[in-house]
Interface confidence: medium
């Protein structure tokens, strides 16, 4: 069961998973100037059996300037909806994740991948929060969030983490300081974690031959 919502936003904090539950999807996103190849995959899917889990499919990006004439498989549209994003932090190999049954490790990077990874989480997924550089963590409880199913609806538990503006960085176990500085961010996006939520659509019936798709992005 996919989690309906994004993990909670904590001011001056970002989250990541130490491992990904089977059923998790990772969109094949490409950096600016590149797009997915048609013969490639829409997403990677964490699949497996009781003894081993791995990512099904590989992501491939090609230059937007290069026409791709392969016509057999799914095209790879830019996906900015129903998505959970975590900043790519260089390099991320969470601790002990391979030993977790029913979970996949962080997928290796692919050529020309986007600066943010877009995951579709499933029920039972746990994500861990850390304060961004320049902020210190005041722990008042667990700094993690779990996607739970309650009364037929999914929800994320609220992490008890406050990040204060002191020049000190809280980090994940065994990790170096994050160095990511995602490129191409719209200026309006000021937090270090961008979770793109839903779009609103406004359609107007028009007595002309023109059909319009109007969307408004909001955070």
């Amino acid at each position: 069961e996919l989690c309906d919502d994004d993990p909670p936003e904590i001011p001056h904090a970002t989250f990541k998973a130490m491992a990904y539950k089977e059923g998790t999807m990772l969109n094949c996103e490409c950096k600016r100037g590149f797009r997915r190849i048609k013969s490639g995959s829409l997403y990677m899917l964490c699949t497996g059996n009781s003894s081993h889990s791995s990512w099904d499919n590989q992501c491939q990006c090609t230059s937007s300037a290069t026409r791709n004439t392969t016509k057999q498989v799914t095209p790879q549209p830019e996906e900015q909806k129903e998505r959970k994003t975590t900043e790519m932090q260089s390099p991320m190999q969470p601790v002990d994740q391979a030993s977790l049954p029913g979970h996949c490790r962080e997928p290796p990077p692919w050529e020309n991948e986007a600066t943010e990874r877009i995951y579709h989480f499933v029920v039972g997924q746990m994500v861990y929060y850390q304060c961004v550089q320049g902020y210190r963590a005041l722990h008042r409880g667990p700094a993690e969030s779990v996607c739970k199913m309650t009364h037929g609806k999914t929800r994320w538990t609220q992490p008890q983490l406050i990040c204060t503006g002191e020049m000190e960085t809280s980090q994940f176990p065994g990790e170096e300081k994050p160095q990511a500085s995602p490129e191409g961010r719209p200026e309006s996006e000021t937090s270090c974690l961008v979770t793109t939520t839903d779009f609103q659509i406004q359609t107007e019936m028009a007595a002309t031959m023109e059909t319009s798709i109007f969307t408004t992005e909001y955070q």
Partner: antibody
């Protein structure tokens, strides 16, 4: 019948060149039919075999508009035509549709 | 082409009923299937993506399940505004294809 026609679909409020746009036909009283798709960034197109050679899908990214065009209309082209934004999870946003009526 | 077969083609139900619509694919489409609701004179609207993901803003009485070749859309407790036509769409393999639709009518 026999006339040419070009209908348009304008996208706004998102990065037009980085999303695929699909065209969908709905004949009177019938279901939805996926016609084809275009990537406005480079005008790469793919058609359903049922529509290949019958219509042309194009785009003008400078005005964030995609087009569906017929060179010679037939009575059987009478239908509602929708454009929709194609994302990994299907068709997330749809235009309100353009009704094309072909009569002699 | 992948053929999607919806069943039933039409269905009469009452407000409060639990309704299930099935979509079968002629070959496996993994979870690349979405569900749409269309009301007369209106454009379709997406309800479910990725076979089971609920579109934001869609009431939680709608749910989707399945993978591979068999998928279901369930409405747990029908409301008056739910009477419409429902379509499934596979977006796994070109050409993408819709099911023929299921018309849900008030009993």
């Amino acid at each position: 019948p026999g006339e040419s026609l070009k209908i348009s679909c304008k996208g706004s409020g998102y990065s037009f060149t980085t999303y695929w746009i699909a065209w969908v036909r709905q004949m009177p009283g019938k279901g939805l039919e996926w016609m084809g798709i275009i990537y406005p960034g480079d005008s790469d197109t793919t058609y359903s075999p049922s529509f290949q050679g019958q219509v042309t899908i194009s785009a003008d990214k400078s005005i964030t508009t995609t087009y569906l065009q017929w060179s010679s209309l037939k009575a059987s082209d009478t239908a509602m035509y929708y454009c929709a934004r194609q994302v990994a999870g299907g068709l997330d946003y749809w235009g309100q549709g353009t009704l094309v009526t072909v009569s002699s | 082409d992948i053929v999607l077969t919806q069943s039933p083609s039409s269905l009469s139900a009452s407000v409060g009923d639990r309704v299930t619509i099935t979509c079968r694919a002629s070959q496996a489409v993994r979870i690349d299937l979405s569900w749409y609701q269309q009301k007369p004179g209106k454009a379709p609207e997406r309800l479910i993506f990725g076979a089971s993901g609920l579109q934001r803003g869609v009431p939680s009485r709608f749910s989707g399940s399945g993978s591979g070749t068999e998928f279901t859309l369930t409405i747990s407790s029908l409301q008056p505004e739910d009477f419409a036509t429902y379509y499934c769409l596979q977006h796994n393999t070109f050409p993408y294809t819709f099911g023929q639709g299921t018309k849900l009518e008030i009993k």
